[in-house]
Amino acid sequence: RTTSFPTVTTTAVPTNTTIKSNPTSTPTVPRTTTCFGDGCQNTASRCKNGGTWDGLKCQCPNLYYGELCEEVVSSIDIGPPETISAQMELTVTVTSVKFTEELKNHSSQEFQEFKQTFTEQMNIVYSGIPEYVGVNITKLRLGSVVVEHDVLLRTKYTPEYKTVLDNATEVVKEKITKVTTQQIMINDICSDMMCFNTTGTQVQNITVTQYDPEEDCRKMA
């Protein structure tokens, strides 16, 4: 059999990151400054850096503080995300369904029924994998029915998330290889929910969501 499996590369992530900036004035005071008296009307039009006047004070956006939101905070604490996701791009060939043009149309009843049964079948296949979230069919094409789909995985963020997801992707490979070897047409009969072509299973790509604190910081800035 020729099942092709690619390798996946990810980079390790620190648990917490503080990005320092170099402000020209005193750091870390409250980000809202109350104004009382006649001069407040003037202040309203002078809120800087995207600050908005709420009738009493400038409401400053993240990263700014001061009476007019003119001061830049010195540092931002960026915690890691709650969860990390991975996406495996797979192709399997379903032999128990004949391809029809209607299957190309994702809004057709044929596609919806196929999707429902394929999803049900894959939920059974991957039922023992805690990180398994679901499948998403991206394309159906001729031959009997070639199913291009994503297997979606998710795990809680821990320093070991990469190992957890690497292990999960290996189990996905094992399970899909096993089911597509076992559930095959015998004498043109499929005695299962779905039957597969043993040699039609391929893993094209594995993507793990990267946690990049510097990028997060840039987005916040």
Partner: antibody, heavy 120, light 113 residues
Framework: QVQLQQPGAELVRPGASVKLSCKAS????????MHWVKQRPGQGLEWIGM????????RLNQKFKDKATLTVDKSSSTAYMQLSSPTSEDSAVYYC?????????????WGQGTLVTVSA | DIVMTQSPSSLAMSVGQKVTMSCKSS????????????LAWYQQKPGQSPKLLIY???TRESGVPDRFIGSGSGTDFTLSISSVQAEDLADYFC?????????FGAGTKLELR
């Protein structure tokens, strides 16, 4: 919900062929094989064969290869079975049935059956 | 062709009793690679179409009461009804879904005393 509609009865003269219909609704007609099953009064069930709406391919039990012809009309979601040169042995209830999915081989849905009576 | 043999051909039971009926196949219906037995059971009430009860020898179709229990492996299979109800009066057929031509047993008629 899935429905397979069959006429209740057909009276046919010996030797005159009869064409039985099965109109499907409530599911995607083109991705399921349609099967036909025979049941003689007070007896068991016999699998006749199956046809596929997407390309009209049919597969028959060898026992019925000279008796039954299976066809489909995709536009009306209707499957047909023609019985040639009927004799009293062909008097039976004929069911159309839909498998669990695609090419699966156990039957989740059945028509009400057509009682064929071969009589002069 | 795979021959399916059912026994007994009929049995009479009282409401609440446990019922057991047998189905034997002339060759094994076990797929050794996935350990599934390719056997289905149907119920046919008088004047009605057959209704799927069980497939893969022991998997109940959705909506089928849990008093219906399928068991067995290889060539010997059993359908049990743990506590017979009046509405269970029917013929019961086994069917192999292992190879063409698909074949059925002759049936077991369940009558109520």
């Amino acid at each position: 919900q899935v429905q397979l509609q069959q006429p209740g009865a057909e009276l046919v003269r010996p030797g005159a062929s009869v064409k039985l219909s099965c109109k499907a609704s409530g599911y995607s007609f083109t991705i399921y094989w349609m099967h036909w099953v025979k049941q003689r009064p007070g007896q068991g069930l016999e699998w006749i064969g199956m046809s596929h709406p997407s390309d009209s391919e049919s597969r028959l039990n060898q026992k019925f290869k000279d008796k039954a012809t299976l066809t489909v009309d995709k536009s009306s979601s209707t499957a047909y079975m023609q019985l040639s040169s009927p004799t009293s042995e062909d008097s039976a209830v004929y069911y159309c049935s839909r498998p669990y999915y695609g090419s699966s081989a156990w039957f989740a849905d059945w028509g009400q059956g057509t009682l064929v009576t071969v009589s002069a | 062709d795979i021959v399916m043999t059912q026994s007994p051909s009929s049995l009479a039971m009282s409401v609440g009793q446990k019922v057991t009926m047998s189905c034997k196949s002339s060759q094994s219906l076990l797929n050794s690679s996935n350990q599934k037995n390719y056997l289905a059971w149907y119920q046919q009430k008088p004047g009605q179409s057959p209704k799927l009860l069980i497939y893969f020898a022991s998997t109940r179709e959705s909506g089928v009461p849990d008093r219906f229990i399928g068991s067995g492996s290889g060539t010997d299979f059993t359908l049990s009804i743990s506590s017979v109800q009046a509405e269970d009066l029917a013929d019961y057929f086994c069917q192999q879904h292992y190879s063409f031509p698909l074949t059925f047993g002759a049936g077991t008629k369940l009558e109520l005393r």
